[in-house]
Interface confidence: medium
């Protein structure tokens, strides 16, 4: 990844901090649990333009919806090493493009206002977002070699404890927009036709918390609502995730305490913020917005299927590009017929509505959404159609 030197890690952090925007989205179903649903207002939609959705390493939606304490909209990415170099993105065709390291978006897109915790419940219709087992390299406390672009929520403390890998599957939005995690529909998996139904071999990562529960590994995405679907469980949860539909939990995380500390670190990691992290384009111009979908869908090794997305825990310094024994693939790639294939290449229509698929190192697949006069697309995979009228309203 070509790195552009930045003054310091702090500087880099600042640069990125202003680049992520949490879009608040409420899940109607959330009301059922008696929890306040965040308004429909898309605070970061003020930027009209192409939107990029990123499917990061495996972060699970699991506890993503578990936010009970107000979550501040500020978030920042953590990149490899102190310098936040440019991020190399590969277009679906294979052409590598370098995204500016400083993905800054207008402050307004930052949605810095504290949003009430929206604990959306996945209103899955047909797809299963259950937790999936992911194979992910386990790394000790120290930063792993490959640090997936993580979105860290600033809960008010000077040091952001909770980390949300760029996960966007669990957008707390109306049921119609909820993503069901069951992405690789074409894959065979045990017990379910196109569901990648088996757990990947090892823990994956899912940082979004559906409710107040612990997270689970992510799996692949499947089209749950309409024709769009997040990664399936294997990619959602670091472990054996049974949430292929991006199922979210209902528990109120309010009464949940973090053992030994009272900090919200774990809880927040579990929660899927009511807002979705958005990465602003390096130019910071409203015309180019990248939507980063946390690595909620960590593609883990799915025993019953031929596709494995993530390495298993226990390989802290393992490069995801290739896997040990050739069983693991780099983030954004899946093992297909014995070789690692780009999600973009494997699933030509991964990005809907004409969106262009890109692979970003250490993050995964991103969709750069189409923008037309008066109409543009948004969402992790450009699945939603937005009009200027809707944005203004």
């Amino acid at each position: 990844v070509p790195a552009r030197e930045t003054g310091s890690a702090i500087e880099a952090e600042e640069l990125v901090r202003s680049s992520l925007a949490w879009e608040s989205r409420a899940n109607d179903t959330r009301e059922e649990a008696g929890l306040p649903a965040a308004g429909e207002d898309e605070t970061s939609w003020t930027e009209r333009g192409s939107e990029m959705a990123a499917v990061g390493p495996g972060v699970g939606p699991e506890e993503a919806l578990e936010a009970s304490a107000a979550v501040t909209g500020t978030a920042w990415l953590e990149a490899d090493g102190p310098g936040l170099g440019g991020v190399t993105a590969e277009a679906g065709s294979g052409d590598a493009q370098t995204l500016p390291a400083t993905l800054q978006a207008p402050d307004e897109a930052l949605g810095s206002s504290t949003m009430p915790p929206a604990i959306p419940e996945a209103t899955e219709t047909s797809g299963p977002p259950s937790p999936a087992v992911h194979d992910k390299p386990s790394v000790g406390p120290e930063l792993p070699k490959e640090i997936p672009l993580e979105v860290r929520l600033n809960l008010g403390g000077s040091t952001p404890e909770p980390t949300f890998p760029l996960q966007g599957t669990l957008e707390t939005q109306p049921a119609s927009d909820i993503i069901d995690i069951d992405y690789f529909e074409g894959l065979d998996s045990e017990g379910r036709g196109a569901d990648m139904g088996s757990f990947p071999g090892s823990p994956g990562t899912s940082e979004n918390h559906p409710d107040t529960e612990g997270e689970t590994p992510s799996w692949s995405l499947l089209d749950l609502y309409d024709d769009f679907t997040p990664f399936d469980e294997s990619d959602f949860y670091p472990t054996t995730s049974f949430y292929d539909d991006l199922e979210e939990e209902e528990e109120e995380e309010e009464d949940k305490d973090t053992v030994g500390g009272g900090d919200l670190e774990d809880e927040n990691d579990l929660l899927l913020p009511s807002q979705k992290p958005g990465v602003g384009p390096g130019t910071g111009q409203p015309t180019n917005r990248w939507h980063a979908v946390p690595p909620q869908h960590t593609l883990g090794m799915v025993p019953g299927s031929s596709i494995s997305l993530r390495p298993r825990p226990g390989d802290p310094g393992k490069d995801l590009a290739s896997g040990e024994n050739g069983t693991e693939c780099r983030v954004g790639f899946v093992r297909h017929n014995g070789s690692c294939r780009s999600v973009c290449d494997l699933f030509p229509s991964y990005c809907h509505n004409g969106g262009q698929c890109y692979l970003v190192e250490n993050i995964g697949a991103f969709c750069r959404c189409n923008t037309q006069d008066y109409i543009w697309h948004k969402g992790m995979r450009c699945e939603s159609i937005i009009t200027d009228f809707q944005v203004m309203c």
């Epitope: 386990s138 379910r192 823990p203 399936d232 054996t240 949430y243 298993r312 226990g314």
Partner: antibody, heavy 118, light 113 residues
Framework: EVQLLESGGGLVQPGGSLRLSCAAS????????MSWVRQAPGKGLEWVSA????????YYADSVKGRFTISRDNSKNTLYLQMNSLRAEDTAVYYC???????????WGQGTLVTVSS | DIVMTQSPDSLAVSLGERATINCKSS????????????LAWYQQKPGQPPKLLIY???TRESGVPDRFSGSGSGTDFTLTISSLQAEDVAVYYC?????????FGQGTKVEIK
């Protein structure tokens, strides 16, 4: 209040079949993955199977793969476990459990005893 | 499969004293992407189903008394009951929730001395 109630257990001969049911209430059933966990008399816990909220994905322990089938009817808020080709070693109390996204089981039913004996 | 091994098999502690249960996994259950340890602890009292106490190695489930705490990372974990109460007499299980199949430790029986 979350409640899980298993039923369908009983005495069955080796090679026989049995279908367990788990009626769920108190939460949005279709939004959660569900699992079956069993516990042989005087023994520890063993995860048996799991199913995603939509029912699209299913998972099994090697010990029951090919013999047990997990399913769910979200319209009835019910989880099922069809057990075929039962063996003596399948004798246990079977619990259905609501599964958190991190795969931990936060709510368990009281369990139903399955005895496989000739 | 990840093998979970608990120690000791049984533990007798005086009321009000600290009880410590260890759990070791054959493979790391820590995920670098979210720095979470996919490990849970359960309490099972005689004739009852298990009850989730802690997940992610150290996060208490709602309603669980704060005398229960979990710690550890990677492959070594500990469940601590800071001040044992009579109602804490039970069998405690650790479970790795990181990979399929989900596996449990053999259990540790905690009794009053």
């Amino acid at each position: 209040e979350v409640q899980l109630l298993e039923s369908g257990g009983g005495l069955v001969q080796p090679g026989g079949s049995l279908r367990l049911s788990c009626a769920a209430s108190g939460f949005t059933f279709s939004s959660y993955a569900m699992s079956w966990v069993r516990q042989a008399p005087g023994k520890g816990l063993e995860w048996v199977s799991a199913i995603s909220g939509s029912g699209g994905s299913t998972y099994y322990a090697d010990s029951v793969k090919g013999r047990f089938t997990i399913s769910r009817d979200n319209s009835k808020n019910t989880l099922y476990l069809q057990m075929n080709s039962l063996r003596a070693e399948d004798t246990a109390v079977y619990y259905c459990a609501k599964t958190k996204p991190n795969n931990a089981f936060d709510y368990w039913g009281q369990g139903t005893l399955v005895t496989v004996s000739s | 499969d990840i093998v979970m091994t608990q120690s000791p098999d049984s533990l007798a502690v005086s009321l009000g004293e600290r009880a410590t249960i260890n759990c070791k996994s054959s493979q790391s259950v820590l995920y670098s992407s979210n720095n979470k340890n996919y490990l849970a602890w359960y309490q099972q009292k005689p004739g009852q189903p298990p009850k989730l106490l802690i997940y992610w190695a150290s996060t208490r489930e709602s309603g669980v008394p704060d005398r229960f705490s979990g710690s550890g990372s990677g492959t070594d974990f500990t469940l601590t009951i800071s001040s044992l109460q009579a109602e804490d007499v039970a069998v405690y299980y650790c479970q790795q929730t990181a990979t399929q199949p989900l596996t449990f430790g053999q259990g540790t029986k905690v009794e009053i001395k």
